[in-house]
C-alpha cells in the first residue's frame, strides 16, 4: 500500500439533519501499526493553524462546534475513516481533511478532502434547454447521505405537468447518495416562466424544505403587434412598430427590398422615417428571428404627395398635316386629375391618371403655340408649359403691299411661315431682286411666326415699279406682286433706319 | 554547536508532579521535532513519543498517554516533559533527543535521533 | 509494535579483536518508498546519554571512528568493530524509527 485517502470531494445534506462522510484511507504495509489513530480536521490541513479538531480518536476532545456532533462511524484499523456530523448547522459546512496517526513520525494528513456544503433547498435540475412542444424531464434531487433520517420526495405546483416518477435512493459516482424524483411534461409557450417546486420532508421530524425552479421555454417569434397599412402625407413623420413573443427575445429587423433598414435583439422594434417622402412609400417587411424559428409580417406605407411637375414627352415640332402625340406624365399619391390646356381651353383631360396622352390629327399652323399640362390632388397642383411648332410652307399674307409718300417707295411684305422664310424683292422691269440680307435696302423683323420685310426705295414716287414679293422655305415658295396703295392709304410706321 | 541542556535532578514524592526542561541551542529548534525517551535503572531505552516543534503537535507512544505531557515554549527554544500523578515506577533518567523532520507540503518525514540531552533524574519515593 | 531482538545480551572481546552484534526486527523496516532501512545503533556508556553510530543500517555518522558498520536488510542486522578498542566498552543498542519507534534489550561489550 501507500498514502492515500479516498472520500468524495463533495458532500451535501440537509440543515438540522446529519451526513455519513464516506471515508477509506491506505498507508505503506511495512508500517505494521500496534493501533491506527486518526484525527479530523475542519477547514485547514495543517496542524500548525490549529484547525478545529472534528474528531480525534486518541482522546474525546474536540472543538466545541463539534461537542457531541462528531462519531467515527469506520473502523480506522481497517482502514475506514468514515465520519459522521449530526445536528448540522450551517458554520459546519467547509472543507474537512483526514489525518491517519499511524504512531512513531508517521502521521500524514491527506490532501484529499470533503467539501460539506449544508444546503436548505432541493435541488431542481432543468435541463439548459426547455423547448416548446418537445418532451422534457425536470428532476428534483435531494442528498441522502444521513443514515438516521431519509428526505420524502413531493412536487409542487406541477399540475398540469405530468405524475413524477419516482426513482428512489440513487449512488452517486463518489459513494455519495441522493433521492430523486422525476417529472416528464411537453412544455409549451405558455409555461414560460412557470414556477415549479420541489419539497423534501423529513418523516417523524418538523424538517420540511422547499426549492422553486422558473421554467425558461424556448418558443419561436410571433409578431403580435405590427401596424396596419399606414398612410401619410411627404414631410410628415412615421413611426412603423413591429413587437414579437419569444424566448429568448428575437432578432427584429426591418426590411424593405431586400435591404435591412433596422434591426436590434428586443421585443418590440420602431422604424421612424423622419420627413417621408415618395421614395419611401412601399411595402415593409418585419422577420423576427432566433434560434428556435422565426416570423414575418408586413406593412404598406402609403406616402401621400402633390403631384410632381408634370414631364412632356413627345412631338413638339410637327410638319403640318402630320399626327401629334403628346405624352405629359406625372407622379402623385392620390393619382392627379390631369388636363391639358391650350390658351384656356381644355384640349384633354384624365382623372385619377398618373399619364394624359394628347392627340392632335393633321396639325395646321393654328395648332402651334404654347401649351400647359396641368397635374393636380387635394395635397396640390403642378403645371408644366410646353410649346408645339408647327412647320409649314411660307404663306405671304394679304396685308402685303407697296406705298409711296413723297419721293420714297415702301413695299411691305409680311410672311407667316415655320421655319423663319427667306425674303426677296423683285422688280421686274428692272431686272432686280433684293434680298433681305441687303440691310440698305431692306428691313426685316420677325415676331413669332411673322415675318416683315420692308423694302425702301428713294426717288420712285413718280413712276413706282412692279415689286413681287417671294418667300421660301423647305417646305416651298409663295410669290406676289405687292398691290400700291396711295399715299393716303398708306398707315405704316418706320422701324429702323 | 548543538547542545540539549536538561534541567537537573528531580526527588518527588508519589503523587506529586515533575516539568522536565530541555534546552536547545546551536540549531534552528522548529526544524526538528523534540522526542523523549526512558531509561530506568539498570534498564534498556524507551521511547515516549515525540512533539512536532513546529506545529506543537505531541505524539505519545501507547505507554505513555494520559499522565505525559509533551510541550514547548519555542520563544526561548525549550521543550518541556510534565509528569503528573507520580508512581515509584516512574523513577528513571528521561532523556529528550531531537530528530530531523523534512517538510514537504502539508506532511513530513521524521529521521533518527541524533542529539541527546544528559538526562534528567527522576526519583520517586515516599 | 515491532519488536527488537538483539544478540547476545553480553559479548566479551579481546582488544584488536573484531567484535558484532546482531539485532532481527519482528517486522521488516525497510521502507518501500525509498528503499531505506529505518535502522540505527546507538551506544551508551555508563552515566552517559546513548550516541548515534549508525543510521539507514549502514550511514556512520560524522565523527564516528570508521572501525564501526553496520549492515544488514529486511529484519536482519549487524553492527561490527572491525578492531576492538578500551574506548568501544558500552551498551550498544539497535533501534527502528519506521513504525512507533522501538529499541533492542540492548548489549553490553566487555574487553576480554
Known amino acids: 500500500g501507500h498514502w492515500g485517502a479516498w472520500m468524495p470531494s463533495s458532500i451535501s445534506a440537509f440543515e438540522g439533519t446529519c451526513v455519513s462522510i464516506p471515508c477509506r484511507f491506505d498507508f505503506p504495509d511495512e508500517l505494521r501499526p500496534a493501533v491506527v489513530h486518526g484525527v479530523w480536521y475542519f477547514n485547514s490541513p495543517y496542524p500548525k493553524n490549529y484547525p478545529p479538531v472534528v474528531f480525534k480518536s486518541r482522546t474525546q476532545v474536540v472543538h466545541e462546534s463539534f461537542q457531541g456532533r462528531s462519531r467515527l462511524l469506520g473502523d480506522l484499523g481497517l482502514r475506514n475513516c468514515t465520519l459522521l456530523l449530526s445536528t448540522l448547522s450551517p458554520e459546519l459546512g467547509g472543507k474537512y481533511y483526514f489525518r491517519g496517526d499511524l504512531g512513531g513520525y508517521n502521521q500524514y494528513t491527506f490532501s484529499e478532502h470533503s467539501v460539506l456544503d449544508i444546503i436548505n433547498t432541493p435541488n431542481i435540475v432543468v435541463p439548459p434547454e426547455v423547448v416548446a412542444g418537445t418532451e422534457v424531464e425536470v428532476s428534483c434531487m435531494v442528498p441522502d447521505n444521513c443514515p438516521e433520517l431519509r428526505p420524502e420526495l413531493s412536487w409542487l405546483g406541477h399540475e398540469g405537468l405530468g405524475e413524477p416518477t419516482v426513482l428512489g435512493r440513487l449512488r452517486e459516482d463518489e459513494g455519495t447518495w441522493v433521492q430523486v424524483s422525476l417529472l416528464h411534461f411537453v412544455p409549451t409557450r405558455e409555461a414560460n416562466g412557470h414556477r415549479l417546486g420541489c419539497q423534501a420532508a423529513f418523516p417523524n421530524t418538523t424538517l420540511q424544505f422547499e426549492g422553486y425552479a422558473s421554467l425558461d421555454v424556448k418558443y419561436p417569434p410571433v409578431i403580435v403587434e405590427m401596424n396596419s397599412s399606414v398612410e401619410a402625407i411627404e414631410g410628415s413623420h412615421v413611426s412603423l412598430l413591429c413587437g414579437a413573443d419569444s424566448n429568448p427575445p428575437p432578432l427584429l429587423t426591418w426590411m424593405r427590398d431586400g435591404m435591412v433598414l433596422r434591426e436590434a435583439v428586443a421585443e418590440s422594434l420602431y422604424l421612424d422615417l423622419e420627413e417621408v417622402t415618395p421614395a419611401e412609400d412601399g411595402i415593409y417587411a418585419c422577420l423576427a428571428e432566433n434560434a428556435y424559428g422565426q416570423d414575418n409580417r408586413t406593412v404598406e406605407l402609403s406616402v401621400m404627395y402633390a403631384p410632381w411637375k408634370p414631364t412632356v414627352n413627345g412631338t413638339v415640332v410637327a410638319v403640318e398635316g402630320e399626327t401629334v402625340s403628346i405624352l405629359c406624365s406625372t407622379q402623385s399619391n392620390p393619382d392627379p386629375i390631369l388636363t391639358i390646356f391650350k390658351e384656356k381651353q381644355i384640349l384633354a383631360t384624365v382623372i385619377y391618371e398618373s399619364q394624359l396622352q394628347l392627340e392632335l390629327p393633321a396639325v395646321t399652323p393654328e395648332d402651334d403655340g404654347e401649351y400647359w399640362c396641368v397635374a393636380e390632388n387635394q395635397y396640390g397642383q403642378r403645371a408644366t408649359a410646353f410649346n408645339l411648332s408647327v412647320e409649314f410652307a411660307p404663306i405671304i399674307l394679304l396685308e402685303s403691299h407697296c406705298a409711296a409718300a413723297r419721293d420714297t417707295v415702301q413695299c411691305l411684305c409680311v410672311v407667316k411661315s415655320n421655319p423663319e422664310p427667306s425674303v426677296a424683292f423683285e422688280l421686274p422691269s428692272r431686272n432686280v431682286t433684293v434680298n433681305e440680307t441687303e440691310r440698305e435696302f431692306v428691313y426685316s423683323e420677325r415676331s413669332g411666326l411673322l415675318l416683315t420685310s420692308i423694302l425702301t426705295l428713294r426717288g420712285q414716287a413718280q413712276a413706282p415699279p412692279r415689286v413681287i414679293c417671294t418667300s421660301r422655305n423647305l417646305y416651298g415658295t409663295q410669290s406676289l406682286e405687292l398691290p400700291f396703295q396711295g399715299a393716303h392709304r398708306l398707315m405704316w410706321a418706320k422701324i429702323g433706319p | 554547536q548543538v547542545q540539549l541542556v536538561q534541567s537537573g535532578s528531580e526527588l518527588k514524592k508519589p503523587g506529586a508532579s515533575v516539568k522536565v526542561s530541555c534546552k536547545a541551542s546551536?540549531?534552528?529548534?522548529?526544524?526538528?521535532?523534540m522526542n523523549w525517551v526512558r531509561q530506568a535503572p539498570g534498564q534498556g531505552l524507551e521511547w515516549m513519543g515525540w512533539?512536532?516543534?513546529?506545529?506543537?503537535?505531541?505524539t505519545y507512544a501507547d505507554d505513555f498517554t494520559g499522565r505525559f505531557v509533551f510541550s514547548l515554549d519555542t520563544s526561548v527554544s525549550t521543550a518541556y516533559l510534565q509528569i503528573s500523578s507520580l508512581k515509584a515506577e516512574d523513577t528513571a533518567v528521561y532523556y529528550c533527543?531531537?530528530?530531523?523532520?523534512?517538510?514537504?507540503?502539508?506532511?513530513?518525514?521524521?529521521?533518527?535521533?541524533?542529539?541527546w540531552g544528559q538526562g534528567t533524574l527522576v526519583t520517586v519515593s515516599s | 509494535d515491532i519488536v527488537m531482538t538483539q544478540s547476545p545480551d553480553s559479548l566479551a572481546v579481546s582488544l584488536g579483536e573484531r567484535a558484532t552484534i546482531n539485532c532481527k526486527s519482528s517486522?521488516?523496516?525497510?521502507?518501500?518508498?525509498?528503499?531505506?532501512?529505518?535502522l540505527a545503533w546507538y551506544q551508551q556508556k555508563p552515566g552517559q546519554p546513548p550516541k548515534l553510530l549508525i543510521y539507514?543500517?549502514?550511514t556512520r555518522e560524522s565523527g564516528v571512528p570508521d572501525r564501526f558498520s553496520g549492515s544488514g536488510s529486511g529484519t536482519d542486522f549487524t553492527l561490527t568493530i572491525s578492531s576492538l578498542q578500551a574506548e568501544d566498552v558500552a551498551v550498544y543498542y539497535c533501534?527502528?524509527?519506521?513504525?512507533?519507534?522501538?529499541f533492542g534489550q540492548g548489549t553490553k561489550l566487555e574487553i576480554k
Open positions: 546551536g540549531y534552528t529548534f522548529t526544524n526538528y521535532g
Open positions: 517486522h521488516s523496516v525497510l521502507y518501500s518508498s525509498n528503499q531505506k532501512n529505518y
Open positions: 512533539i512536532n516543534t513546529y506545529t506543537g503537535e505531541p
Open positions: 533527543a531531537r530528530n530531523p523532520i523534512n517538510y514537504y507540503g502539508i506532511n513530513y518525514e521524521g529521521y533518527v535521533m541524533d542529539y
Open positions: 539507514w543500517a549502514s
Open positions: 533501534h527502528q524509527y519506521l513504525s512507533s519507534l522501538t
